[in-house]
């Protein structure tokens, strides 16, 4: 009688993570008597995957009833496949021995490859805000995919970026892989509403790439421009001075009025107006009683924006001239800032 052969008809099997893998194996004879076992890998370090008589293998089921006397089909199904299950599986026939059964013949092996989707890309920006014209770095990470081939692209407001570096780890063979990419983005004053997008394409995604986003509003700081102007006279001895704080982001802002270097009033930006580009404008004004001053008054608008060093703009108020003759710039609306008389 011809010697028993163990036949594994599939050289390779490709399965998506989460699905069930079927590993086929048949024997050509019932003799010698002894069990079939399945292993992953070969040699002394091989891993037992299934033993039909002993051991706990909750993910494995047999395709046919191995207790049937004439059964020669030893195919198995492995459920809930993960990338860690990738490898070469061997169907091995044992013959009865004492004390232990003895390996008799092995199949040629079936290579199980697992396709696993990448995790949703996570985009993270710099820890601290940066101002326009500065270059900032964004990172994008995605994990757990297999096979290794993957494509990553960066976009800013739909426009593809070219200044980035990408690594896929590990370099050698692995059950699954991770991708890490760093992109450099130059900020502009108009970027408050901008988005940076990391897009990952992989064979498991069937042409529908995964995207991770970061809003530049979390990254950018647009410093304000200041303009101090003197408004037309309200009364014979009063001058209205305004400080226009324009095009700033984020909103966190504190303004201090100084009269000849002495703090007159401090307020926090509240009722701001938003510009189309996402930046804010705000105005504060002071009502100055010039009759209380013998000398010229230096009024300073000092602004501390988002915890940064203060910036200021000054205006010299000539007391000697009649208030009505003072030069004035554009009229400003009353934004509801508190009036403050200086006596």
């Amino acid at each position: 009688e011809e010697e028993l052969q163990v036949i594994q008809p599939d050289k390779s099997v490709l399965v998506a993570a989460g699905e069930t893998a079927t590993l086929r194996c048949t024997a050509t004879s019932l003799i010698p008597v002894g069990p079939i076992q399945w292993f992953r890998g070969a040699g002394p370090g091989r891993e037992l995957i299934y033993n039909q008589k002993e051991g706990h293998f909750p993910r494995v089921t047999t395709v046919s009833d191995l207790t049937k006397r004439n059964n020669m089909d030893f195919s198995i199904r492995i459920g809930n496949i993960t990338p860690a299950d990738a490898g070469t599986y061997y169907c091995v026939k044992f013959r009865k021995g004492s004390p232990d059964d003895v390996e008799f013949k092995s199949g040629a092996g079936t290579e199980l490859s697992v396709r696993a989707k990448p995790s949703a890309p996570v985009v993270s920006g710099p820890a601290a805000r940066a101002t326009p014209q500065h270059t900032v770095s964004f990172t994008c990470e995605s994990h757990g995919f297999s096979p290794r081939d993957i494509t990553l692209k960066w976009f800013k407001n739909g426009n593809e970026l070219s200044d980035f570096q990408t690594n896929v780890d590990p370099v050698g063979e692995s059950v699954s892989y991770s991708i890490h990419s760093t992109a450099k983005v130059v900020l502009t004053r108009e970027d408050v509403h901008s988005q940076v997008i990391c897009e990952v394409a992989h064979v498991t995604l069937q042409g529908d790439p995964l995207r991770g986003t970061a809003n530049l509003s979390e990254t950018i700081r647009v410093p304000p421009t200041l303009e101090v102007t003197q408004q037309p006279v309200r009364a014979e001895n009063q001058v209205n001075v305004t400080c226009q704080v324009r095009k700033f982001y984020p909103q966190r802002l504190q303004l201090t009025w100084l009269e000849n270097g002495n703090v007159s009033r401090t307020e926090t930006a509240s009722t701001v107006t938003e510009n189309k580009d996402g930046t804010y404008n705000w105005m504060s004004w002071l009502l100055v009683n010039v009759s209380a001053h013998r000398d010229d008054v230096k009024l300073t608008c000092q602004v501390e924006h988002d915890g940064q060093p203060a910036v200021s703009k000054s205006h010299d108020l000539k007391v000697s001239a009649h208030p009505k003759e003072q030069g004035s710039n554009t009229a400003a609306e009353n934004t509801g800032s508190n009036e403050r008389n200086i006596y």
Epitope: V33, P44, G45, R46, E47, L48, Q52, K53, E54, G55, H56, F57, D65, L66, T67, K96, P99, D100
Partner: antibody
Framework: QVQLVQSGAEVKKPGASVKVSCKAS????????MHWVRQAPGQGLEWMGR????????KYNPKFQDRVTITVDTSTNTAYMELSSLRSEDTAVYYC???????WGQGTTVTVSS | EIVLTQSPGTLSLSPGERATLSCRAS???????LYWYQQKPGQAPRLLIY???NLASGIPDRFSGSGSGTDFTLTISRLEPEDFAVYYC?????????FGGGTKVEIK
Amino acid sequence: QVQLVQSGAEVKKPGASVKVSCKASGFNFEDTYMHWVRQAPGQGLEWMGRIDPAEGDTKYNPKFQDRVTITVDTSTNTAYMELSSLRSEDTAVYYCVRGNYVNWGQGTTVTVSS
Amino acid sequence: EIVLTQSPGTLSLSPGERATLSCRASSSVSSSYLYWYQQKPGQAPRLLIYSTSNLASGIPDRFSGSGSGTDFTLTISRLEPEDFAVYYCHQWYSYPRTFGGGTKVEIK
């Protein structure tokens, strides 16, 4: 659900034999081995042997080789363990265990006393 | 036969503490064949971990197993009151099948 129901407690005299039964239900009895494990009072677990119900093939712990016999009756899905020439140190709880090591019988207390 | 030596024999710990139980084999055991059980007084052993590191069904993930060759470890990350019991390692790599002598985890 899977169940292994063992026979009741036994009290035996030294030199006698005891036969403990284990009735299986909820699974294909011939699928896996059936093992027998014992535990003396306050002691650890000791493997005695196993049987392949499909073929009647047995393996025994050399310590018990001459005194233990494991058999099955596939018509009733029952495994048996017989221990002969009992001595006081055979006083123990005897468990039948399915080949997957998940399912254990409730245990049978065998007391050997003169 | 493969002799499994468990240490310590008794481990006295408080709830919330980490327990590390050792099982050393007299000769190499393939990790697929090393199992751990938990046994409480008057009960049959319960399979805890199979193939060195896989949790059996219904076992909380505070239990974990590791090791290879001749050295294996069962770890309980944070002891709960119901974890105080006796733990056994077991090999079925070769005949005769053997169990370790057990480690009793008791309340300090």
